[in-house]
């Protein structure tokens, strides 16, 4: 025997009363599939979340983050504060990258400049808080009289971070 509830379309739920099989979802609730026994409460985009798509009787609201924050997690379930390039987020707020490290994103953490000498190369362009160094040809490849920029840089061997 077919379940009578299976006839209830999205946007409705299956009532217990025999005379009233399919009941529209009440305000601020939805059902996205047919045959549901109850409607789900709409997601509310509050605080650092803002509404990207309003809730309807057949689909949940969708949120994103307010300016100055970025989404994390499925369906933007979390918002994390942005920082500027050249910074990283700590509990005390956005902090500039330490000398010898950089961050080219508005999120994430600073990481050390590449140590060009580990690859037998020289520094072509100095690193900054926002950008990694650019490595050039090895010192031996440079023509006589040419010099490369060689600022002090922390080692960037795998597994080692600046302290």
């Amino acid at each position: 025997l077919q379940d009578p509830c299976s006839k209830c379309p999205a946007g409705t739920f299956c009532g217990k009363n025999k005379n009233q099989i399919c009941i529209p979802c009440p305000p601020n609730s939805f059902s996205s599939t047919s045959g549901q026994k109850a409607c789900d409460i709409c997601r509310q985009c509050k605080g650092v979340f803002r509404t990207r798509k309003e809730c309807s009787s057949t689909s949940n609201a969708e949120c994103d983050c307010t300016p100055g924050f970025h989404c994390l997690g499925a369906g933007c379930s979390m918002c994390e504060q942005d920082c500027k390039q050249g910074q990283e987020l700590t509990k005390k707020g956005c902090k500039d990258c330490c000398f010898g490290t950089f961050n080219d994103q508005k999120r994430g953490i600073c990481r050390p400049w590449t140590n060009c000498s580990l690859d037998g190369k020289s520094v072509l362009v100095n690193g900054t808080k926002e950008r990694d160094v650019v490595c050039g040809p090895s010192p031996a490849d440079l023509s006589p009289g040419a010099s490369s920029v060689t600022p002090p840089a922390p080692a960037r061997e795998p597994g080692h971070s600046p302290q």
Epitope: L72, G73, G108, T114
Partner: antibody, heavy 116, light 108 residues
């Protein structure tokens, strides 16, 4: 949608080498850290290390430094965890997770069994 | 590196409040995050940055963090909350993530 899909379960003998993988999709793989987390049978979560796929910079937990190698190939959005010589004590579930502090997406886990 | 200590187990009657502690030297100076793990599943964030709750996580979950202790509180605990819970923090000394040993929450 964002997904991290890990390679299948492995059964190995002590002394053998192994490389397991974690393929990311649905986001800019190069610009998010990937961490590896170990869970031995019936035990808790242990953070092993992380990699920034954009430039393959790695950072290890002192407990795992020199024991494993983390790498990535950003061209195929895949991170790797490898051992050169497995031990019975490496038997565990290994998870990859996106992030360095907040791990917002996790792989399904790769079960590694090392037994003679 | 910082060490995070959790009680191995906590038991609570349905409808009661469960509190799971996570202690570590000056953990209040760092963000604490909490994960729930059910058998055979990957962990899921239930609290991030000390006190923030991801959407989709019930309002009964809350968190706090100050001094040497971070706390996960589950008010009106339900049977479905039975799981292992892990605290974690990212430390800028060593640039590593540390997990607590985990707490098995049993709903009686």
């Amino acid at each position: 949608q964002v997904q991290l899909v890990q390679s299948g379960a492995e059964v190995k003998k002590p002394g053998e080498s192994l490389k397991i993988s974690c393929k990311g999709s649905g986001y800019s793989f190069s610009t998010y850290w990937i961490s590896w987390v170990r869970q031995m049978p019936g035990k808790g979560l242990e953070w092993m290390g992380k990699i920034y796929p954009g430039d393959s910079y790695t950072n290890y937990s002192p407990s795992f430094q020199g024991q494993v190698t983390i790498s990535a190939d950003k061209s195929i959005s895949t991170a790797y965890l490898q051992w050169s010589s497995l031990k019975a004590s490496d038997t565990a579930m290994y998870y990859c997770a996106r992030g360095y502090g907040i791990f917002d997406y996790w792989g399904q886990g790769t079960l590694v069994t090392v037994s003679s | 590196d910082i060490e995070l200590t959790q009680p191995p187990s906590v038991s609570v009657a349905p409808g009661q409040t469960a509190r799971i502690s996570c202690s570590g030297d000056n953990i209040g100076d760092q963000y604490a995050h909490w994960y729930q793990q059910k058998p055979g599943q990957a962990p899921v964030v239930v609290i991030y940055q000390d006190k923030n709750r991801p959407s989709g996580i019930p309002e009964r979950f809350s968190g706090s963090n100050s001094g040497n202790t971070a706390t996960l509180t589950i008010s009106g605990t339900q049977a479905e909350d039975e799981a292992d819970y892990y605290c974690s923090t990212y430390t800028f000394v060593g640039f590593t993530t540390v997990f607590g040993g985990g707490t098995k929450l049993t709903v009686l």
